[in-house]
Amino acid sequence: ARNGDHCPLGPGRCCRLHTVRASLEDLGWADWVLSPREVQVTMCIGACPSQFRAANMHAQIKTSLHRLKPDTVPAPCCVPASYNPMVLIQKTDTGVSLQTYDDLLAKDCHCI
Amino acid sequence: ARNGDHCPLGPGRCCRLHTVRASLEDLGWADWVLSPREVQVTMCIGACPSQFRAANMHAQIKTSLHRLKPDTVPAPCCVPASYNPMVLIQKTDTGVSLQTYDDLLAKDCHCI
């Protein structure tokens, strides 16, 4: 269930895809990745107010219980719903290789 | 990649499964669920320090970028890695029915 996409906190404040430009050094990958040397990291950032992009029944439960017990139960969290793949050239024991990572870049986001 | 399960913040402080007892009223389900009248909700709660139960490459990236830009990039978040199903008896237009929900109770947790 993909619930409301209207953000009650104002434009851009709720859970959505953001892009952060990062070097291999930033990512701690400089010792094993050779290319690309810069990555446009897409990640899910933002608040998850009541029923905003609720991923499933569990997210809806979490919202209800957070309202009741905010000190015990955290609000739902903005995380990737799916990913975009990315190919890296990486060092190996025997030389170099191309490797596709399917779980590297967020494609879209939901609250859970 | 399921990384370290040792919590550097002390026992029970990091991302793990918690159980919260909730009534149908707590969950906002009283108007459509008939049974069970109380649910032992299992959910994922706790901190996600560096590489603790990192779900995938994206979680590892998020940890690195959070360390660099804590005001921009949030730390990974404790969310369900899988779910346990639960059967509810619910009201329908024509009477009652049994319905299995596959995404209601967290089974185990990871950081993402």
Partner: antibody
Framework: QVQLVQSGAEVKKPGSSVKVSCKAS????????ISWARQAPGQGLEWMGG????????NYAQKFQGRVTITADESTSTAYMELSSLRSEDTAVYYC???????????WGQGTMVTVSS | DIVMTQSPLSLPVTPGEPASISCRSS???????????LDWYLQKPGQSPQLLIY???NRASGVPDRFSGSGSGTDFTLKISRVEAEDVGVYYC?????????FGGGTKVEIK
């Protein structure tokens, strides 16, 4: 095996724009970067720019900055290169190629001949 | 911009004999990670370029082992151990250390 299939030849007037497409046939871009290069008649190769996953922002050669726009539509697995303010010196075969970052350009399109003539 | 200079401009070869092409860069292509950001491409008559060697010395998938790349810093060599008739075309070196990516002027290999 993925192939890059480019749009057909174009004849353009000086001052106009051209938009060349590059579609991944038999697959998607699947996490590879897309670079664009051109080759004037009888000349060598010249890199114009490229775009890396998730295909949000492109990197351009300074020479083409402000005149070239590289985009990609993942839903259709198609990359585009638009060159504006065309002049006769832009007459060339334009190639797209997939790579990892800017290197390892292992699959190339068949090329699109763009002729700029009044 | 990094200037890439190839020699010779033209190389007449005898099938079965070795051949060697030189490529010089105006500045070092050796990255601090120990790898040279240099590729070699072959453009056969009437065709698009094809990748032969990447990162200085790594043969691309499907490339015959008669092709080898060597060198470091500013001086690089592409060797063909035994030239075959299908190897004719223009060979280009390309630096990918910094943008703009630049190509050498090309070396035309033809059968004597």
């Amino acid at each position: 095996q993925v192939q890059l299939v480019q749009s057909g030849a174009e004849v353009k007037k000086p001052g106009s724009s051209v938009k060349v497409s590059c579609k991944a046939s038999g697959g998607t871009f699947q996490g590879y970067a897309i670079s664009w290069a051109r080759q004037a008649p009888g000349q060598g190769l010249e890199w114009m720019g490229g775009i890396i996953p998730p295909y949000a922002t492109a990197n351009y050669a300074q020479k083409f900055q402000g005149r070239v726009t590289i985009t990609a539509d993942e839903s259709t697995s198609t990359a585009y290169m638009e060159l504006s303010s065309l002049r006769s010196e832009d007459t060339a075969v334009y190639y797209c190629a997939r790579g990892v970052g800017e290197l390892h350009l292992d699959v190339w399109g068949q090329g699109t001949m763009v002729t700029v003539s009044s | 911009d990094i200037v890439m200079t190839q020699s010779p401009l033209s190389l007449p070869v005898t099938p079965g004999e070795p051949a060697s092409i030189s490529c010089r860069s105006s500045q070092s292509l050796l990255h601090s990670n120990g790898y040279n950001y240099l590729d070699w491409y072959l453009q056969k008559p009437g065709q698009s370029p094809q990748l032969l060697i990447y990162l200085g010395s790594n043969r691309a998938s499907g490339v015959p082992d008669r092709f080898s790349g060597s060198g470091s810093g500013t001086d690089f060599t592409l060797k063909i151990s035994r030239v075959e008739a299908e190897d004719v075309g223009v060979y280009y070196c390309m630096q990918a250390l910094q943008t703009p990516i630049t190509f050498g002027g090309g070396t035309k290999v033809e059968i004597k």
